[in-house]
C-alpha cells in the first residue's frame, strides 16, 4: 500500500504533500479508486452485469466476424482495389480491433474488475480508446476522401497507394496516441482529487477532452456530408433541366440522402449518448451518469457492428463477394463477381463510396 513518489507527469497536476512531492497511488487496488469516485465496484454478478456481458460477448463475436468478412472481401475482389476500399478495409480492421478490445473488457468487467491492477485497468480502457478512435478517424478519412472525389467529379480518387498507406498509418498512430495518453500521464493516479466518476483512474479533464474531440470529429463529418449532399443536389437539379433522365437523377440523389442519413444517424445514435454522458459526468454533479454508463458503452460499440452493415451490405457487389466467400465459390471473373451489373443499383457504391455515377455517365 506504499505511495510511490515519482516525477510529476507532464499533463496531470498531482496533489502535493508537505514535502512538496506528488502523492501517487500506482500500487493501490482498483477498489481504492472506485471508492473515491463513488462508482460501484461489484462483488457478485447481478442480472444487469450478466445481461451486459452476454450481450457484449455476442456483439463482439459479430463485430469480429463481420469486419473480418469485409477485409477478406476487399482483399479477394480486385474491383475493390481502390483507395476508398482500402479505407473501408482499415475501418473494418479498426472495428475488428474494437471487437477484440471489448472482448477483453467483457472478461474484466463486473466483479472481475476487482482483480485488475492500475496498469491492467489502464490497458483495458486504453484498448477501447484506441479502437474507438481508430474507428472514428476512419469514418472521418472516408468522409474526406468522398468529399475530394465528389468535388473533383471522379469515380475514385487518384490517390496513390503510398498515400493511402500514409493515411492509414496516421489513423493508427493517432488512435494509439489517444489510447495511450492516460497511461503515460493524463490520469488521476497522482491527482486523486480530480478523478472522474465514470472512469475512476481518468482525470475529469481527459474525459472532457475525449468527449469534445469526438464530438468535434462528428460535427466535421456532418459538415462534410452536408456539403457533399448540397453539392450533389445542386448539380442534379441543374442537370435535370438539361437531360432526359431527371427520374434517375432524383433516385440517385435520394439514394445518397438515404445513405448519408443512415451513416450519420448510426453515428449520432451510437456515439452521442456516451459522449454527452462523459460531459455530464464532469459538468453535472447531480446527474446519475453511472446508471446509464454500461448501456451507452454497448451502444458506442454497436457502431463497430453497424459500420460493416452500412458501408458494405448496401453495396450489391460487396454482398455478392460475401456470398462467394461464405459459400466457398470460386469466381469465374477475376475482376469481380458483378462486372456487368447495373452499377447505379449499388446505392452505396454510387453515392457515398464511389461518387454519384451511373454506368459510364457522370451525374455530378
Amino acid at each position: 500500500m506504499a505511495a510511490i513518489s515519482t516525477s510529476i507527469p507532464v499533463i496531470s497536476q498531482p496533489q502535493f504533500t508537505a514535502m512538496n512531492e506528488p502523492q501517487c497511488f500506482y500500487n493501490e487496488s482498483i477498489a481504492f479508486f472506485y471508492n473515491r469516485s463513488g462508482k460501484h465496484l461489484a462483488t457478485e454478478w447481478n442480472t444487469v452485469s450478466k445481461l451486459v456481458m452476454g450481450l457484449g460477448i455476442t456483439v463482439c463475436i459479430f463485430i469480429m466476424l463481420a469486419n473480418l468478412l469485409v477485409m477478406v472481401a476487399i482483399y479477394v475482389n480486385r474491383r475493390f482495389h481502390f483507395p476508398i476500399y482500402y479505407l473501408m478495409a482499415n475501418l473494418a480492421a479498426a472495428d475488428f480491433f474494437a471487437g477484440l478490445a471489448y472482448f477483453y473488457l467483457m472478461f474484466n468487467t463486473g466483479p472481475n474488475t476487482r482483480r485488475l491492477t492500475v496498469s491492467t485497468w489502464l490497458l483495458r480502457q486504453g484498448l477501447i480508446d484506441t479502437s474507438l478512435t481508430a474507428s472514428v478517424a476512419n469514418l472521418l478519412a472516408i468522409a474526406i476522401e468522398r468529399h475530394i472525389t465528389v468535388f473533383r467529379m471522379q469515380l475514385h480518387t487518384r490517390m496513390s497507394n503510398r498515400r493511402v498507406v500514409v493515411v492509414i498509418v496516421v489513423i493508427w498512430t493517432m488512435a494509439i496516441v489517444m489510447g495511450a495518453i492516460p497511461s503515460v500521464g493524463w490520469n488521476c493516479i497522482c491527482d486523486i482529487e480530480n478523478c472522474s466518476n465514470m472512469a475512476p483512474l481518468y482525470s475529469d479533464s481527459y474525459l472532457v477532452f475525449w468527449a469534445i474531440f469526438n464530438l468535434v470529429t462528428f460535427v466535421v463529418m456532418v459538415v462534410l456530408y452536408a456539403h457533399i449532399f448540397g453539392y450533389v443536389r445542386q448539380r442534379t437539379m441543374r442537370m435535370s433541366r438539361h437531360s432526359s433522365g431527371p427520374r434517375r437523377n432524383r433516385d440517385t440523389m435520394m439514394s445518397l440522402l438515404k445513405t448519408v442519413v443512415i451513416v450519420l444517424g448510426a453515428f449520432i445514435i451510437c456515439w452521442t449518448p456516451g459522449l454527452v454522458l462523459l460531459l455530464l459526468d464532469v459538468c453535472c454533479p447531480q446527474c446519475d451518469v453511472l446508471a446509464y454508463e454500461k448501456f451507452f458503452l454497448l451502444l458506442a460499440e454497436f457502431n463497430s457492428a453497424m459500420n460493416p452493415i452500412i458501408y458494405s451490405y448496401r453495396d450489391k457487389e460487396m454482398s455478392a463477394t460475401f456470398r462467394q466467400i461464405l459459400c466457398c465459390q470460386r469466381s469465374e471473373n477475376p475482376t469481380g463477381p458483378t462486372e456487368g451489373s447495373d452499377r447505379s443499383a449499388s446505392s452505396l457504391n454510387h453515392t457515398i463510396l464511389a461518387g454519384v455515377h451511373s454506368n459510364d455517365h457522370s451525374v455530378v
Partner: antibody, heavy 122, light 107 residues
Framework: QVQLQESGPGLVKPSETLSLTCTAS????????ISWVRQTPGKGLEWIGE????????YYNEKFKGRATLSADKSKNQASLKLKSVTAADTAIYFC???????????????WGRGTLVTVSG | DIQMTQTPSSLSASVGDRVTITCRAS??????LAWYQQKPGEAPKRVVY???TLTEGVPSRFSGSGSGTDFTLTISSLQPEDFATYYC?????????FGQGTKLEIK
Amino acid sequence: QVQLQESGPGLVKPSETLSLTCTASGYTFTSYGISWVRQTPGKGLEWIGEIYPRSGNTYYNEKFKGRATLSADKSKNQASLKLKSVTAADTAIYFCARESISRRLGWNFDVWGRGTLVTVSG
Amino acid sequence: DIQMTQTPSSLSASVGDRVTITCRASENIYSFLAWYQQKPGEAPKRVVYNAKTLTEGVPSRFSGSGSGTDFTLTISSLQPEDFATYYCQHHYGPPLTFGQGTKLEIK
C-alpha cells in the same frame, strides 16, 4: 446555509427496527455523500455507513452489514438509516454527516447534524 | 480494518500553552487523515483534513502534520474555546474508523 437535521424516535424497543431520517438543506443533495456515525460512551465515534445519492451506491461498516440499510429520497432531500434487531448496545447519539467534496467521495465530513439520542429499552 | 490509536487519552494544559496530540494508524493511510473537535452536547467539527489542510474558518494556531502512519495535531497557543475532545479519523476509504479521542482540559 448548509444544514443537516436528524429525526426519528428517541426510544426503540429491543429487537425492533430503529428508523432515522436526515434532512439536508442549503446545497445540492445528490452531489454529496451522506454518512451515518454513532457515538456511544463506551466505544466513541463509530462509522455505520455512507450513501451516495447521485448513484444510490451504499458503503457499510462490516459490523453493521445485514443489519443496517441506507437509502435516499432525492425528491425530499432526505437520507435514511434503518437498523434492524436493536439491542441495548445500540443506545447512542446518531449523527448524519455530509461528505466534504462534491461529485466524489473524500471520506471526511465538513457538515454534521446535531445528532439524535436513541435509547433502546424495553 | 485500519485501527486508529490516539495519544494521550486526556491532557491538561493552560491557556497559551502549545499542545500536541498524536494519532497512529495501523497501516499506511498516506495523508488521508482528518481531525475533529467536539464540545459537550455538540456534533464533531472538522479542524484538519488531508493530514495538514486546515478547514476554512479554523484559526491558524491549529496545524496538522504527518503522513503514512504517524500524525500530529498541534495547537500553538491554546485559547479558552479550544478545550474540547479531539478525534482523528482516517479517510483512506471504507470502513472509516476514528481514534478513541483526546480530552483536552484546563489545568
